[in-house]
Interface confidence: medium
């Protein structure tokens, strides 16, 4: 005979589970239905009655199938300075992020309470770590045959250009000056930009059946002017 | 305008528990952190913790943790705190104040103060 | 735990005369450029009230005689002429990592 589906709420059989988006109720001993993503529980379930969900509120949300008496509050309104990268509905928390040119440099759960600047490498320096989300660029003095003449957060040493006859030897921030019309070989025009860093932060989700703890808002601090860094700068 | 309106005096036996409350108006609650400072009669400030109404999430120093609980009640944007196995060293006033979670990161309105009498 | 330090712990300052609080910290309470440290104002029976965060900025409402200035680990708030109602305690505060700590308190008196 096949197994009968049980309809919610049912007593699960002695050492099994209750069955996906299903969870089990302690004070019925029985397993009930979960509410779907949006929605919250607004009536526990009884030994004759199952859950009853209700729709999350304005500014409020939930993620994951659940059981929670009430729907976990979306983050911070982002600051004037950030992108709000995901908006707030009722399936998902809002997320601001850093916006371009910019890092997380001090947070907490909540998100990131100070966005700052990424380090610019003035020239003579080219950048050796490119900035992610929460770490700022690192800059290195260019090596013997490598040059860097702009101040970026984003260019990295490039080589001199070899020439048939140098008129100008170049350095750590300038290129050699060729005599000849045309060098024997050089770099194509233009800057070697390492790319910006690009968000890879992962929407916080709350377990079930406890809301999350962690919203993962992030929050801008205007800045005030930075100390320039060796080989950087806070312009 | 903001404001934060803290319970009122309290008096406890050694050994026994409090809870403090703080109601929030003029902001959105969920939106900053309310933190917990206490100051014994004549002495300086102490940070006890903070939370975050939103989440949920705490804050401790690790002086009071185990001892210490701080919750909120978003629905009516109150926010307590509550100390347990008191002793008379914990006789104080029971401060609770709001910092921004962006922008000046300090206590910029405070409660008026609860006053703790631990004694037997 | 970051301790701070704040030096004189009295102060006796003649009305329209400057007044100078240090604030010295275990360990440098600077991020990215910014300072984590901020002046309150305590007066007797009364909570404590902003005055300057992030080392220099003025609180709203505020009287300007107020300023606040350092970096790092050594800060300064100035009273640039102290007025009658200024008598109080002052505290500094960092809050660049947990747990948040406060100064002893300086005490300024009229002399």
């Known amino acids: 005979l096949p197994a009968q589906v049980a309809f919610t709420p049912y007593a699960p059989e002695p050492g099994s589970t209750c069955r996906l988006r299903e969870y089990y109720d302690q004070t019925a001993q029985m397993c009930c239905s979960k509410c779907s993503p949006g929605q919250h529980a607004k009536v526990f379930c009884t030994k004759t009655s199952d859950t009853v969900c209700d729709s999350c509120e304005d500014s409020t949300y939930t993620q994951l199938w659940n059981w929670v008496p009430e729907c976990l509050s979306c983050g911070s309104r982002c600051s004037s300075d950030q992108v709000e990268t995901q908006a707030c509905t009722r399936e998902q928390n809002r997320i601001c992020t850093c916006r371009p040119g910019w890092y997380c440099a001090l947070s907490k759960q909540e998100g990131c309470r100070l966005c700052a600047p990424l380090r610019k490498c003035r020239p003579g320096f080219g950048v050796a770590r490119p900035g992610t989300e929460t770490s700022d660029v690192v800059c290195k003095p260019c090596a013997p045959g490598t040059f860097s003449n702009t101040t970026s957060s984003t260019d990295i040493c490039r080589p001199h250009q070899i020439c048939n006859v140098v008129a100008i030897p170049g350095n750590a921030s300038m290129d050699a000056v060729c005599t000849s019309t045309s060098p024997t070989r050089s770099m194509a025009p233009g800057a070697v930009h390492l790319p910006q860093p690009v968000s890879t932060r992962s929407q916080h989700t709350q377990p079930t059946p406890e809301p999350s703890t962690a919203p993962s808002t992030s929050f801008l601090l205007p800045m005030g002017p930075s100390p320039p860094a060796e080989g950087s700068t806070g312009d | 305008q903001v404001q934060l309106v803290q319970s009122g005096a309290e008096v406890k036996k050694p050994g026994a528990s409090v809870k403090v409350s703080c109601k929030a108006s003029g902001y959105t609650f969920t939106d900053d952190y309310i933190d917990w400072v206490r100051q014994a009669t004549g002495q300086g400030l102490e940070w006890i913790g903070e939370i975050y109404p939103g989440s949920g999430n705490t804050y401790y120093n690790e002086k009071f943790k185990g001892r210490a609980t701080l919750t909120a009640n978003k629905s009516i944007s109150t926010a307590y705190m509550e100390l347990s196995s008191l002793r008379s060293e914990d006789t104080a006033v029971y401060f609770c104040?709001?910092?921004?979670?962006?922008?000046?990161?300090?206590?910029?309105?405070w409660g008026q103060g609860t006053l703790v009498t631990v004694s037997s | 735990d970051i301790v701070m330090t704040q030096s004189p712990d009295s102060l006796a300052v003649s009305l329209g005369e400057r007044a100078t609080i240090n604030c010295r910290a275990s360990e440098s309470v600077d991020n990215s450029g910014n300072s984590f440290m901020h002046w309150y104002q305590q007066k007797p029976g009364q909570p404590p009230k902003l005055l300057i965060y992030r080392a220099s900025n003025l609180e709203s409402g505020v009287p300007d005689r107020f300023s606040g200035s350092g970096a790092g680990t050594d800060f300064t708030l100035t009273i640039s002429s102290l007025q009658a109602e200024d008598v109080a305690v002052y505290y500094c505060q960092q809050s660049k990592e947990d747990p948040y700590t406060f100064g002893q308190g300086t005490k300024v008196e009229i002399k």
């Open positions: 104040a709001r910092s921004q979670v962006y922008g000046k990161i300090a206590m910029d309105h």
